[in-house]
């Protein structure tokens, strides 16, 4: 067990703050909730506290939640290559680039850290050449989300991990929305982190309404599991 | 454009596509007698590139997002330089995310003919 992962035993309030600007609509999203890496449960809720928000909320989904990826839960065999984790309490920086197909982009950074028991995703999104009718800006998404795998690797040059998904957003026209995830995490401290075998996160997430909540929000219930590493041949003999 | 050995060159060239559709941009020379090649890629997510071994310490690849445009600086020329310049943009093949050498290249530039004399 990492030293960090032992901070992940029991239920961790999470706290998230974004503040975005996409095509210079500016907006901000406070997020308060909790999670459960025995579990890899997530239970969130997001208001937007300016007012209403510019984007669809579930283009943000990846940037809240995807966000805290500490909370995945690594079966035993797959411990040994969870990043995320390792890098508590210190935590880690998460740089994403988000395209959207035939339409504008997503920039985001985020420190992910402990503050006191609280773990904390503060992020910064910078949103440029969107359509002003587009998908996003049009508000065309269906507020839901579809299941996705998120495919890691270790990035030994910068003592961290890649990641690359690819996000099918469903449109009210019974389209789809491709958006693709190129993500890099880099430890803030200077302690020991797991790098890595190639595997991906298997992820389940549903978003609801709080039917006494008149601010525009977002109810998040998500579950992340790791897996695409096998048990190796001493496991099998045992 | 034409330069002498140990002059410098700056190519640019602008895509239309969208940022999905050209997550890597890169520059390709065909010069005499050989088959195209891969002079330097750029990964547009964060600026990750690649450099031919004859062109490492020479040549530098960048891009500017908001205009949609690749650059490549080229210094201390040499003959065997010479070439037409071709620039391309695409995505990464399936499996390879982070990998623009070997992208599948959609749009390809018209060229431009870089001379180096002696």
């Known amino acids: 067990m990492s030293k960090g992962e032992e901070l992940f035993t029991g239920v961790v309030p999470i706290l998230v703050e974004l503040d975005g600007d996409v095509n210079g609509h500016k907006f901000s999203v406070s997020g308060e909730g909790e999670g459960d890496a025995t579990y890899g449960k997530l239970t969130l809720k997001f208001i937007c506290t300016t007012g209403k928000l510019p984007v669809p909320w579930p283009t943000l989904v990846t940037t809240f939640s995807y966000g805290v990826q500490c909370f995945s839960r690594y079966p035993d065999h797959m411990k040994q290559h969870d990043f995320f984790k390792s890098a508590m309490p210190e935590g880690y920086v998460q740089e994403r680039t988000i395209f959207f197909k035939d339409d504008g982009n997503y920039k985001t950074r985020a420190e992910v850290k402990f503050e006191g028991d609280t773990l904390v995703n503060r992020i910064e999104l910078k949103g440029i050449d969107f359509k002003e009718d587009g998908n996003i800006l049009g508000h065309k998404l269906e507020y839901n989300y579809n299941s996705h795998n998120v495919y890691i690797m270790a990035d030994k040059q910068k003592n961290g991990i890649k990641v690359n998904f690819k996000i099918r957003h469903n449109i009210e026209d019974g389209s789809v929305q491709l958006a693709d995830h190129y993500q890099q995490n880099t430890p803030i401290g200077d302690g020991p982190v797991l790098l890595p075998d190639n595997h991906y996160l298997s992820t389940q997430s549903a978003l609801s309404k709080d039917p006494n909540e008149k601010r525009d929000h977002m109810v998040l219930l998500e579950f992340v599991t790791a897996a695409g590493i096998t048990h190796g041949m001493d496991e099998l003999y045992k | 454009g034409s330069v002498q050995t140990g002059g410098s060159l700056g190519l640019s060239c602008t895509t239309s596509?969208?940022?999905?559709?050209?997550?890597?941009m890169g520059w390709f020379r065909q010069t005499p007698g050989k088959e195209r090649e891969g002079v330097a890629t750029?990964?547009?997510?964060?600026?990750?590139?690649y450099y031919a071994d004859s062109v490492k310490g020479r040549f530098t690849i960048s891009e500017d997002s908001a205009k949609n445009t690749v650059y490549l600086r080229m210094n201390s020329l040499k003959p065997e330089d010479t070439g037409m310049y071709y620039c391309?943009?695409?995505?990464?093949?399936?499996?390879?995310?982070?990998?623009?050498?070997?992208?599948?290249?959609?749009?390809w530039g018209q060229g431009t003919q870089v001379t180096v004399s002696s």
């Open positions: 596509l969208d940022g999905y559709s050209s997550v890597c």
């Open positions: 391309a943009a695409g995505r990464p093949k399936s499996g390879s995310a982070w990998n623009c050498r070997d992208a599948e290249y959609v749009y």
């Open positions: 750029i990964h547009r997510a964060f600026g990750d590139t």
